[in-house]
């Protein structure tokens, strides 16, 4: 999947653009908004009617090296009595993010962008019921 | 499990792991072969904490289109379709990495940017604060 060129006609390539080899792009890894923090409600993973656990994946050849993945604890949802209600479903909510991978090509090191699908949390949904004729 | 050492008082220094500027292959490797993100496309309507999806478009960013979730209700939807205000619909947020064109309008020069997106909503029991 190639990164699309800028589409609008008024986005002509400015003279100030750095020279880049064919088939490559220049990437500055100094992150904009580096210290931004998630401000989610407290402990929503345990307070949710579709609670989830977190697993940390760690990869020394990836930036960011740490990616946190959620897994729904139950197939059903937790009702007001604290019991699992299997007439409802806990389902994962997912979001794509980019990561940067450091790879080896022969004797040289190269960099590749990868799309990774992160499971962010879970939500409780009414199941889709298929009626058999 | 895996434990990542972390000093909460320090800024994230993980970027020590990568050079400040790198040349990257234009092709983006997509490893999501086993999971179909479209599978969750109707969850926003079927959830007990439903949400609306708002299109955020920015031609200076890759991906240029990001969908932002906004919870429809303060409470959660009951089986009878009514909203239960004893429960709360809350957004699930995620930090993601995107590419920002830098300098602006340049086709093949980018900088990594961390952005916060609301991906969907979940129904939670509220935190009750008892006043003495």
């Amino acid at each position: 999947r190639k990164i699309p060129k800028v589409g609008h006609t008024f986005f002509q390539k400015p003279e100030s653009c750095p020279p880049v080899p064919e088939g490559s792009m220049k990437l500055d890894t100094g992150i904009i908004n580096e210290n931004q923090r998630v401000s989610m409600s407290r402990n929503i993973e345990s307070r949710s009617t579709s609670p989830w656990n977190y697993t940390v994946t760690w990869d020394p050849n990836r930036y960011p090296s740490e990616v946190v993945q959620a897994q729904c604890k139950h197939l059903g949802c937790i009702n007001a009595q604290g019991k699992e209600d299997i007439s409802m479903n806990s389902v994962p909510i997912q979001q794509e993010t980019l990561v940067l991978r450091r790879k080896h090509q022969g004797c040289s090191v190269s960099f590749q962008l990868e799309k990774v699908l992160v499971t962010v949390g879970c939500t409780c949904v009414t199941p889709v019921v298929h009626h058999v004729q | 499990g895996i434990a990542i050492p972390r000093n909460s008082g320090c800024p994230n220094s993980e970027d020590k792991n990568f050079p400040r500027t790198v040349m990257v292959n234009l092709n983006i490797h997509n490893r999501n072969t086993s999971t179909n993100p479209k599978r969750s496309s109707d969850y926003y309507n079927r959830s007990t904490s439903p949400w609306n999806l708002h299109r955020n478009e920015d031609p200076e960013r890759y991906p240029s289109v990001i969908w932002e979730a906004k919870c429809r209700h303060l409470g959660c939807v009951k089986a009878d379709g009514n909203v239960d205000y004893h429960m709360n619909s809350v957004p699930i947020q995620q930090e993601i990495l995107v590419l920002r064109r830098e300098p602006r309008h340049c086709p093949n020069s980018f900088r990594l940017e961390k952005i916060l997106v609301s991906v969907g909503c979940t129904c939670v029991t509220p935190i009750v604060h008892h006043v003495a």
């Epitope: 697993t55 760690w58 | 792991n17 490893r31 999501n32």
Partner: antibody, heavy 117, light 106 residues
């Protein structure tokens, strides 16, 4: 020839410390992430810790978090594992392994650590 | 915590037969990779397969890996005498190993 040679194992009492070393040769050491994996007698493999090519990122198994520290000296082509507050359950053969991005492609022969009073 | 379950625990086969080893993950993650290792008594593990299906350098083509999501398979098309060993699967990224499958001579 790509080679990894571990050393520093031995018999140690519970609560004491030990430092393992791994000497690498035959490849550009500072280009690769490195790991420690252990195997208790008659048991399976357990990943212990890993470190990126330039020490910028480190990971630890929950079982050793806060007790073990992984480090490397690229100038000496060496990987280390500082093991503190050792327990009987840390008794194992400790392997040093090279990371090839998707797996561990080169392993040493291991060094034995025995924790016993 | 991610668990990799290998089956069967022991596989008793004769040289020339086909061996099929299974590895099931309790959770599938995008950006995690599955590898297979072979270990003989008194020896270090040896990488056979990485990224689910890619053969490591010097590994004979009788070894093949397949699978996706949570179910993975290592197949040895025709067992040679030197293939009798313990085989481990591993999820790179979560750093979990399976408990191993012993392939023994029948």
């Amino acid at each position: 020839e790509v080679q990894l040679v571990e050393s520093g194992g031995g018999l140690v009492q519970p609560g004491r410390s030990l430092r393992l070393s791994c000497a690498a040769s035959g490849f550009t050491f500072d280009d690769y992430a490195m790991h420690w994996v252990r195997q208790a007698p008659g048991k399976g493999l357990e990943w212990v810790s890993g470190i990126s090519w330039n020490s910028g990122s480190r990971g630890y198994a929950d079982s050793v978090k806060g007790r073990f520290t992984i480090s490397r000296d690229n100038a000496k082509n060496s990987l280390y594992l500082q093991m503190n507050s050792l327990r009987a359950e840390d008794t194992a053969l400790y392997y040093c392994a090279k990371d090839m991005v998707y797996a561990l492609d080169v392993w040493g022969q291991g060094t034995t650590v025995t924790v016993s009073s | 915590e991610i668990v990799l379950t290998q089956s069967p625990g022991t596989l008793s086969l004769s040289p020339g037969e086909r061996a099929t080893l299974s590895c099931r993950a309790s959770q599938s993650f995008s950006g995690s990779y599955l590898a297979w290792y072979q270990q003989k008594p008194g020896q270090a593990p040896r990488l056979l397969i990485y990224d689910t299906s890619s053969r490591a350098t010097g590994i004979p083509d009788r070894f093949s890996g397949s699978g996706s999501g949570t179910d993975f398979t290592l197949t040895i098309s025709r067992l040679e005498p030197e293939d009798f060993a313990v085989y481990y699967c591993q999820q790179y990224g979560t750093w979990t190993f399976g408990q191993g499958t012993k392939v023994e001579i029948k």
